[in-house]
């Protein structure tokens, strides 16, 4: 959903204070263009391409590390990149993950305590319950999409020759093997931390020992901190203190402005990394591409199962959601779409739903007119629990391992892998190859031999990554939807619902015609006088 | 109801090819996996490997890659097991067996079994 | 390879005993352990699959247990029929592997 620029008297799009300090003015056209709009002259190609840039950079920066990835591993001599050579070739998008991986930490808690603290209990519930109701709808209809794709396709017939190079004795060792309880259980463990510090870096995971009682050997869970955030806990803790903040009245206002300063500041960070941002994913493609062995062979025996993936999630991320979107909201979701492609390709690039959280903040705010409070409390969430493409993903392959084994599936099981799907891709919390793990719960569930998860994780690093595409797409569509449910509740109600706690100082508000903006985003006079800055808009990039 | 039945024994020279067949009646022969299992005299049960009946791909044990052909003739719903190149220690016999839909790998139905002696 | 270790290897009981055979994985094999009756010169026959269910037909003498390494096979109360060697199988993971049988005689 593409918010109206603030207009000046004469027309033009509002000034923005740019990330570096200064104001940068666009024309209405340009907004157009930026917003999906079509390019006719000579005049308008040049204006579209200049609001797109970033854009257009994502996109042949991905198409860019693709071919130089293909370039590098079929030159091979001179060329040839051994582990030592390989991990400096792909330092430079090393170097965007770390960056992104820097932001999350701050910029999750800050701005889910800012975004809880700033919405009126009951708007929270609301919005709370409608955004979960929404991950969890479309999440099974990902899963069902997934089965009824499988079961046509049938990959696992068509692929079980690969059962013959792999042999009898598959890697069940490569499986995780743990309880379904206990994944559920460590789940809610996580949503609970005992220490938030290490919360930040480290999660709980039960793992098992096997001890000798009474003469019999029984095995026996054990807890312990893995390496990895608790992005599930702080998520938690963050909209929790957010609420109590809230609740404390003019006392917590210091520390909410506190945090919604915080977040301002880390939002200007991203603005500066999304620049690089095609430089790092351009390296990351081709690294991967570099180092699959034989992406060919792969392709020749896995070929059906991943086209299901990638057509399965083809299907969810351009029509599904578009259209779920377009009922509701009337609007064109492929323009909405065209306003988070950085963030899309960034998913790709990255391949964790966590690590692109800072750029799609930032474009649902900018390109789509999403509100602060909206975004910054909803995309928090959908990166740790709404995976659709991880579920898609996860059904797909429970059913080509039950082709490919040849097991049956009547419909109790068929609805068991759906409902398993949707509620073990919660607990994959926007973790990089986290859905392979949670695939052994799956096939656990519905006595599907596990020995073939060898076989996934061999295509995971493409599957995984139009996964993550999918889910960080569903966040924001998500996001947009309750932008458009709040847009209408605020129409129809006299006192608004949703109140902006504000970091800046207070100016005179500017009075601006409802109509011509998002009725959320609130105005005031910028500091030259007679521009006006809509204060939910940061930076211009 | 499921029976499967296998050609009978065979008494073999070392270096002679073999082929045992298994012919499934009284179930879809497509919808279930068809597996070999081994027992040579006064010894247990070892798993051969099994075919893909509906794929038609055969996958072997580890210590019957070579030798050991798998095919199928969808048509008749038979199965075969082509042994080439014969050696004294294939005396055995040899099981048909099909394999669950279900929970994993176990064989629900069995073939009497073909006995193969391989002497000079 | 999994392997699967039978015991006792052989056993004397008579009729209407209850007897008991036990079978260890050499890892956690969830609960996939299925039992095979054969009687000599015949193929073997399914008792008891994926731990405790009964094959279609079996009678209801025959039980199986267990969980993760150490599973067991109980036979109510001893028929004639009944003597025969039993095999316990791993379903878990590929290959499927036996165990070396348990020849239940008449004492």
């Known amino acids: 959903m593409v918010a109206d620029p603030p207009r000046d008297s004469k027309g033009l799009a509002a000034a923005e204070p740019t990330a570096n300090g200064g104001l940068a003015l666009a024309s209405i056209e340009d907004q157009g263009a930026a917003a999906g709009g079509y390019c006719g002259s000579r005049d308008q190609v040049r204006r579209c391409l200049r609001a797109n840039l970033l854009v257009l950079l994502t996109v042949v920066a991905v198409v860019a590390g693709v071919a130089l990835g293909l370039g590098v591993s079929g030159a091979g001599g001179a060329l040839a990149l051994g582990p030592e050579r390989l991990s400096a070739f792909v330092f430079p998008g090393e170097l965007l993950l770390r960056l992104l991986r820097m932001i999350i930490l701050p910029l999750v808690v800050c701005s889910l305590i800012g975004g809880a603290a700033s919405l009126d209990p009951g708007a929270l519930g609301r919005l709370g319950a409608w955004a979960l109701l929404f991950f969890l709808v479309t999440t099974l209809l990902a899963s069902a999409l997934g089965v009824g794709l499988a079961l046509a396709l049938q990959p696992g017939a068509a692929s079980a020759a690969i059962n013959a190079s792999v042999g009898a004795a598959g890697s069940a060792e490569n499986a995780p093997s743990k309880e379904v309880l206990d994944s559920f259980l460590d789940l809610a463990r996580n949503i609970f931390p005992s220490n938030l510090v290490s919360a930040a870096f480290r999660s709980y995971s039960t793992t098992y020992e096997e001890r000798n009682i009474t003469g019999t050997r029984v095995k026996v869970p054990v807890g312990q901190e893995v390496e990895g955030m608790n992005i599930l806990g702080l998520v938690v803790f963050a909209i929790v203190f957010g609420v109590a903040l809230r609740k404390l009245g003019p006392e917590g206002e210091l520390l909410i402005r506190f945090f919604n300063s915080f977040n301002e500041a880390t939002m200007v960070l991203v603005s500066w990394i999304m620049w690089y941002a095609p430089v790092g994913i351009m390296f990351l493609v081709a690294g991967k591409i570099v180092e699959m062995e034989d992406v060919g062979l792969l392709f020749a025996r896995l070929g059906k199962y991943i086209l299901c993936c990638l057509l399965g999630h083809a299907i969810h991320g351009l029509l599904v959601l578009p259209l779920i979107y377009f009922l509701f909201t009337r609007k064109n979701p492929y323009r909405f779409l065209w306003g988070i492609v950085t963030p899309l390709a960034t998913a790709f690039g990255t391949s964790s739903s966590s690590a692109t959280l800072p750029l799609m903040m930032k474009c649902v705010e900018e390109n789509n007119g999403v509100a602060k409070h909206i975004s910054r409390f909803i995309l928090p969430i959908g990166a740790t629990v709404n995976m659709d493409g991880a579920a898609l993903f996860q059904c797909v392959a429970a059913v080509f391992i039950a082709q490919l084994s040849q097991q049956s599936l009547d419909f109790v099981k068929i609805i068991t892998i759906l409902v398993t799907a949707t509620a073990s891709s919660v607990g994959a919390a926007g973790i990089p190859a986290g859905g392979v793990l949670t695939l052994a719960i799956i096939l656990e569930a519905v006595n599907l031999p596990v020995d073939h998860i060898s076989l996934i994780l061999a295509v995971d690093w493409l599957v995984d990554r139009s996964c993550t595409v999918l889910n960080v797409e569903g966040d924001a569509l998500g996001a947009g939807l309750l932008q458009n449910y709040v847009d209408r509740t605020e129409s129809r109600s006299t006192e608004p619902e949703l109140i902006q706690v504000k970091s800046e100082l207070p100016l005179d508000p500017l009075p601006v015609p409802t109509e011509e903006g998002n009725p959320l985003l609130k105005h005031y006079r910028g500091p030259a006088g007679d521009a006006t800055v809509a204060s939910e808009k940061e930076s211009v990039m | 109801q499921v029976q499967l039945v296998q050609s009978g024994s065979e008494l073999k020279k070392p270096g002679a090819p073999v082929k045992v067949s298994c012919k499934a009646s009284?179930?879809?022969?497509?919808?279930?996996?068809m597996s070999w299992v081994r027992q040579a005299p006064g010894q247990g049960l070892k798993w051969m490997g099994w075919i893909h009946t509906y794929a038609g791909v055969p996958i072997y044990g580890d210590d019957f890659k070579g030798r050991f052909v798998f095919s199928l003739d969808t048509s008749v719903s038979t199965a075969y097991l082509q042994i080439s190149s014969l050696k004294a220690e294939d005396t055995a016999v040899y099981f048909c067996?099909?394999?669950?839909?279900?929970?994993?790998?176990?064989?629900?139905?069995w073939g009497q079994g073909t006995t193969v002696t391989v002497s000079s | 390879d999994i392997q699967m270790t039978q015991s006792p290897s052989s056993l004397s009981a008579s009729l209407g005993d209850r007897v008991t055979i036990t079978c260890r994985a050499s890892q956690d094999i969830r609960n996939y352990l299925n039992w095979y009756q054969q009687k000599p010169g015949k193929a073997p026959k399914l008792l008891i699959y994926?731990?405790?269910r009964l094959h279609s037909g079996v009678p209801s003498r025959f039980s199986g247990s267990g969980s993760g390494t150490d599973y067991t096979l109980t036979i109510s109360s001893l028929q004639p029929e009944d003597f025969a060697t039993y095999f316990c199988q791993q379903g878990h993971t590929l290959p499927p592997t036996f165990g070396q049988g348990t020849k239940l005689e008449i004492k």
């Open positions: 067996a099909r394999r669950s839909d279900n929970y994993r790998y176990f064989f629900d139905y």
């Open positions: 009284g179930y879809t022969f497509s919808t279930f996996g």
């Open positions: 994926y731990t405790s």
